[in-house]
Interface confidence: medium
Amino acid sequence: ASVGLPSVSLDLPRLSIQKDILTIKANTTLQITCRGQRDLDWLWPNNQSGSEQRVEVTECSDGLFCKTLTIPKVIGNDTGAYKCFYRETDLASVIYVYVQDYRSPFIASVSDQHGVVYITENKNKTVVIPCLGSISNLNVSLCARYPEKRFVPDGNRISWDSKKGFTIPSYMISYAGMVFCEAKINDESYQSIMYIVVVVGYRIYDVVLSPSHGIELSVGEKLVLNCTARTELNVGIDFNWEYPSSKHQHKKLVNRDLKTQSGSEMKKFLSTLTIDGVTRSDQGLYTCAASSGLMTKKNSTFVRVHEKPFVAFGSGMESLVEATVGERVRIPAKYLGYPPPEIKWYKNGIPLESNHTIKAGHVLTIMEVSERDTGNYTVILTNPISKEKQSHVVSLVVYVPPQIGEKSLISPVDSYQYGTTQTLTCTVYAIPPPHHIHWYWQLEEECANEPSQAVSVTNPYPCEEWRSVEDFQGGNKIEVNKNQFALIEGKNKTVSTLVIQAANVSALYKCEAVNKVGRGERVISFHVTRGPEITLQPDMQPTEQESVSLWCTADRSTFENLTWYKLGPQPLPIHVGELPTPVCKNLDTLWKLNATMFSNSTNDILIMELKNASLQDQGDYVCLAQDRKTKKRHCVVRQLTVLERVAPTITGNLENQTTSIGESIEVSCTASGNPPPQIMWFKDNETLVEDSGIVLKDGNRNLTIRRVRKEDEGLYTCQACSVLGCAKVEAFFIIEGAQEKTNLE
């Protein structure tokens, strides 16, 4: 057989035995002569380069460039390829020699008792167990253990070749610790050497680059890229890097295995690429490829190299941000720069710190924007290396949809006496101010909630046909006053008033305010009664544990059967729009109450007394009276609010202060609580007594010390006390300067 390409000037070496395969018996002599055109050498099995005592290579006596190979008493192990070749070329002639040795059909390796085969569990991979045969046509099977399994050639993926060995899909023997080949000759079994099976992994779970993205450097800085490959156990990994400036002198590559935790069923390999001083030519794509032989995974990242540190605002940076109350506002600081700048936010010149309502970072986030967040926000970017600064102002405008103040204050079902003049008010707060406030009305009986009519929370009235107040036919005579603007609680509000000249008809009135971000409405139940009147004694709003009486007064000649009820079990819905009176139509929702009747010359007075009022007593109370003649029922409703008892608290702190002799000190101590607390002042833990220089005003809230003297120095305490306890704040007043001598002295 010929190997290699024929040269122009050289013929292949010529063998004395002109066969591809030679079969000889054991113990005979093998002799082959090789002739050629230049210096020749022989290679033979089990000794690929020369010196073994049994093999003799001699120069031929009859010519130049001729060598004879002689092996006396050949054995099975001499089976294999014999190659004659020209030195320093790949021109060769080969003959394969089988030495038939029926006592030893497998060729033993030169190494000793066992071999090693490396396999992977890949379904598609085969492995060759190199049990070569000294006889070409043996019946060979493969034995694997433990447990013992035997595999025979199947004409497909399992086969034996005397020159190659036993081929089998690797997963079939991956369980085994060892394998060997076995041949049967004349009912006699012959075994090859044992081969230890080593399962080599190949699977790569992933390849991760760190940093994974956004890598920016300036010229001269060090680049360090870590490439981590996570693999199954028994895997070896080769790393390969591709990067823009491959001929980099300052490049360093370090590969190492990483320790994994005990119990981990994977291996980690790390390759670190370091470039000590990057240049602009190092900018570009860096790719790390990890290969296990059967599997390759890659990961890439882009490295940007800047000429020098810089900072600038991006083109998308906003200057005006508009938001509605309650929204989450995000103002991103859009910048270009390296390294990333330090970012500081200011509001109206004051630095912003992050807390649970605001996050001041790359993005200024206001969790639930309120109108007090309106203002100018300045973001200052500082380059940490060059200290270059850039600033940008963002104006935040917070819009408020119309809010109608009385909505939560006025009882929805209070009654109005027949014939009286009444003013209904809607006080609207909105940013921007409402572009209109409109009033509408509806007759009560057209809109009364019959028990059979379903009323939803979103649409609490079965009526929908609101009429404009200009059309007051069949209703009360109405006049809408011009909107007024008032500063209420420090806010600019729009006040719209509707004047009912004479309360003749029970009706519903609705004011609706609209601005650019929303609308608000308030429905007023205007129930006109000729019937009883309700008054509260002693106070409109009692506090818990105080006593209160509800008086229902009715003309005895007109009314009889006065009865007190409480509306229940749920209070009336106040905010979305309220159920209209008369509640007399639906007594199922009323709870009858015990009350005491008194009379004077003209009236019956039914008194319902609440001793030690509690928060549970809050709600709508109904006085029902029956017309003596017509037997028609009349209802009057009054909402009772019970104020919660609150222990005293003092808002704001007293500040320590230093004052010069002769000057004045003015401090205030604002306390809240229910019942309202009493305020007392102490100096050095003794009660402060008013005199010509010490003045206490506004229920002791404000303390003034006129023409301070040295002896006014000390610890001042403001204490607010009620039955629920005390609260106090303290401050130290230091008086500086020498005491002036008076004329008297």
Epitope: Y205, V207, E232, G263, M266, K297, N299
Partner: antibody, heavy 117, light 109 residues
Framework: EVQLVESGGGVVQPGRSLRLSCAAS????????MHWVRQAPGKGLEWVAV????????YYADSVKGRFTISRDNSKNTLYLQMNSLRAEDTAVYYC??????????WGQGTLVTVSS | SYELMQPPSVSEAPGMTAQITCGGN??????VHWYQQKPGQAPVLVIY???ERPSGIPDRFSGSNSGNTASLTINRVEAGDEADYYC????????????FGGGTKLTVL
Amino acid sequence: EVQLVESGGGVVQPGRSLRLSCAASGFTFSSYGMHWVRQAPGKGLEWVAVISYDGSNKYYADSVKGRFTISRDNSKNTLYLQMNSLRAEDTAVYYCAKDWSGPITLWGQGTLVTVSS
Amino acid sequence: SYELMQPPSVSEAPGMTAQITCGGNNIGSKSVHWYQQKPGQAPVLVIYYDSERPSGIPDRFSGSNSGNTASLTINRVEAGDEADYYCQVWDSSSDHHVVFGGGTKLTVL
């Protein structure tokens, strides 16, 4: 036969606890990492937790971290999931599954957990 | 955390080729596994390590993975292939976390 059988599911009120078990047979349980994976009704698969073959390493999905605990008893060939402070969104079929790294080669048939008041 | 995007549904006529994709940032750097789930049953592994097929899975099923997309291809689609298919990877950013795609419903017309 190689199999995983889950048990311990049922109806439970929000805020309460439940413990799921998974009995393994037909393979060397102590040699394999094990997962819990869940599937809400009509929804996709959501990984819950994993434990290494010897129990020394445990990892959890963010949605259950601090509430669920995965554990195993190799002597009993059993995997556990202790579920505390249950929420309505924990309602799902819970599968126990074999193999730590790479693919999940064996799944149980699942046990239904319903969190409802 | 890492996210895998799958189309909610794919339809194909019997005998045709169906392809289901699984998108993820640089998913080619990760190993992807695919599961088939039929109604009322537990999932079954159909492709692992991007393209390997467990024994018992027909050679009509194949997989590939590179760049930002992994794909499951089913040649000569049969009625019995109608099921939900899920892709899965390990998420390295949170070590040892397993991430599933949202699932794709394969309908055989």
